[in-house]
């Protein structure tokens, strides 16, 4: 079938990195600056990516491959591909429509990225807390309370851990 | 595009040579270092990109290192040999991309015991 | 690593001829190539980027052809000015952030 197909149709021969020019006899022509064809036997380039604004380049755009971009700081990545940029926030925040907003009591955001989760709630594995949580670190589970010899306390344990999701606005 | 700071060193000390520019904005370039032994061909050490990446060709990764403040490139070189004795030239990349388009004259590097 | 072949290492033709110079690439680089000039004591001068497009400046007896891995620079309607070396050079991405953006060996233009 291939040898078939590279006799009736002269476009297949052309590589990836050119395209079948109809202007000039069906010849390979190189794609031009800003344009990119990722297969053979292409009778058009696609044009390039560009990192504009808050983009910025990773990889710039070559005959064979599209540009790739990520985000400049204080940013970061969204959609397949990057096709999104996000405001990053500190630890210890989310971001909600309003802008970056501390976590609330009882959740927590290790990331410059994402939701607050709750913190884990140790009684639900019969254990207690070890290490309180904070707004950027969950809590650190310890062995249960029967585990723990006579006369040793353990740390209250937080309130009641909510359902994920955005802090009240 | 001019080069600065290429100058006779012994083998083992660092130097840096740097790369100022006028007339166009680094950070919207891909800013290349190219280097020629006497008598030689050219090869091609790496760029930074309009991003801050940094790309390196295989044999000069690790030893070499390019970094960019608003007006000037530096390429830092490390462990240098006899070998690394070249004019290195610093570049702008042609229309978005790392071809060298835009080259300065080049700074003479000898590196002797 | 990719390699770039450039033939002939040397050519010698009168004023007015042609001249063609070669250039392969050990794997395809699409169309990723460039050719550049270079007089004794002065920076390389690019002439032709992504195989064919013409740099600014640069007058219309250089052309570049090819793509994949051979590629070809023509120099025609020789000039006095034209005696030079002549190096291709690709642009090829490797992994690891690492660049195979060699240049090939050259090739002197003289006269005869």
């Known amino acids: 079938f291939e040898r078939t197909r590279s006799l009736q149709d002269p476009c297949s021969n052309c590589p990836a990195g050119t395209f079948c020019d109809n202007n000039r006899n069906q010849i390979c022509s190189p794609c031009p600056p800003n344009s990119f064809s990722s297969a053979g036997g292409q009778r058009t380039c696609d044009i390039c990516r560009q990192c504009k604004g808050v983009f910025r380049t990773r990889k710039e755009c070559s005959s064979t491959s599209n540009a790739e971009c990520d985000c400049t700081p204080g940013f970061h990545c969204l959609g397949a591909g990057c096709s999104m940029c996000e405001q990053d926030c500190k630890q210890g925040q989310e971001l909600t429509k309003k802008g970056c907003k501390d976590c609330c009591f009882g959740t927590f955001n290790d990331q410059k990225r994402g939701i607050c989760r709750p913190w884990t709630n140790c009684s639900l594995d019969g254990k207690s807390v070890l290490v309180n949580g904070t707004k950027e670190r969950d809590v650190v589970c310890g062995p249960s309370p029967a585990d723990l010899s006579p006369g040793a306390s353990s740390v209250t344990p937080p309130a009641p851990a909510r359902e994920p999701g955005h802090s009240p606005q | 595009v001019e080069e600065s700071g290429g100058r006779l060193v012994t083998p083992g000390t660092p130097l840096t040579l740097t790369c100022t520019v006028s007339g166009f904005t680094i950070s919207s370039h891909h800013m290349i270092w190219v280097r020629q032994a006497p008598g030689e061909g050219l090869q091609y050490i790496g760029f930074?990109?309009?991003?801050?990446y940094t790309y390196y060709t295989n044999w000069a990764k690790g030893r070499f290192t390019i970094s960019r403040t608003s007006t000037t490139v530096d390429l830092k070189m490390t462990s240098l040999t006899a070998a690394d004795t070249a004019t290195y030239f610093c570049a702008r990349g042609v229309d978005g991309t790392s071809y060298p388009g835009l080259w300065g004259p080049g700074t003479l590097v000898t590196v002797s015991s | 690593d990719v390699v770039m072949t450039q033939t002939p290492a040397s050519v010698s033709e009168p004023v007015r001829a042609t001249v063609t110079i070669k250039c392969q690439a050990s794997?395809?680089?699409?169309?990723?190539l460039a050719w550049y000039q270079q007089k004794p004591g002065q920076p390389p001068k690019l002439l032709i980027y992504r195989a064919s497009t013409l740099a600014s400046g640069v007058p219309s007896r250089f052309s570049g052809s090819g793509s994949g891995t051979e590629f070809t620079l023509t120099i025609s309607d020789l000039e006095c000015a034209d005696a030079a070396t002549y190096y291709c050079q690709c642009i090829y991405y490797g992994t690891d952030d690492v660049i195979y953006h060699t240049f090939g060996g050259g090739t002197e233009v003289v006269f005869k």
């Open positions: 794997q395809s680089i699409g169309a990723d």
């Open positions: 930074i990109n309009d991003g801050d």
